[in-house]
Interface confidence: medium
């Protein structure tokens, strides 16, 4: 999906309003120094591409993030403010339902969410600099 035509201000507001709180809750008890930030992004659409990938694409050691509250809110936000986004996700959602796994918060998942926090911050700082 091409995130170029999203309403970035509205996405920023949704992140600051609710998604950030859920991410912080998820990361509670860990420190940024516990993980190395290895993922970055260069502009707003690129940041959203990376955020979508880390949030919704299962990895071998972290398969369950898409069921978390911050992921659900992220999905709703992207569907609301990115034209045509929800249509592109129908097949992906159906495939995910077939792969449902036991929910376990692993260290790898914490690392992934730590990366997400960094990407969201980058997204907003990029947004501020463009105004």
């Amino acid at each position: 999906y091409d995130f170029t035509n999203c309403d970035f201000q509205k996405i920023e507001a949704d992140y600051l309003r609710t998604i950030s709180k859920d991410l912080i809750t998820y990361m509670s008890g860990t420190k940024s120094t516990d993980f190395n930030n290895t993922v970055s992004c260069s502009n707003r659409p690129h940041c959203l591409t990376e955020i979508q990938s880390l949030t919704f694409n299962p990895t071998p050691r972290c398969a369950s993030l898409a069921k978390e509250m911050f992921a659900r809110k992220t999905k709703a936000t992207l569907a609301l403010w990115c034209p045509g986004y929800s249509e592109t996700q129908i097949n992906a959602t159906q495939a995910m339902k077939k792969r449902r796994k036991r929910k376990v918060t692993t260290n790898k998942c914490l690392e992934q969410v730590s990366q997400l926090l960094g990407l969201w911050r980058r997204f907003i700082r990029t947004l501020l600099k463009k105004q």
Partner: nanobody, 127 residues
Framework: EVQLVESGGGLVQAGGSLRLSCAAS??????????IGWFRQAPGKEREGVSC????????YYTDSVKGRFTISSDNAKNTVSLQMNSLKPEDTAVYYC??????????????????WGQGTLVTVSS
Amino acid sequence: EVQLVESGGGLVQAGGSLRLSCAASGFTFADYDYDIGWFRQAPGKEREGVSCISNRDGSTYYTDSVKGRFTISSDNAKNTVSLQMNSLKPEDTAVYYCAVEIHCDDYGVENFDFDPWGQGTLVTVSS
């Protein structure tokens, strides 16, 4: 549970001082270098950003109307952020909220439509 609790509000005469405090529970300000700030909402008015502090480097930012009168500071050991308010004016009357992860920088205090994490603390400045 992740929570922010604001305290320190009250009734004060114009020219007086108050110190607001924001205490976090369920997470630690220093853990992820969160940006933390204060917002206020006066009756019948829109919420506005007042001040914020970046835990990355301690940078502080203020909206123009409070510059030179308000001072924000953080105490990571106590997991609190304080707002020292001096030379208070009647127009400072509002409910004050603190918020986290707000991304303050040279562009000023990011003013956004957030759901307050805490109940806020009421500051009333009489003339």
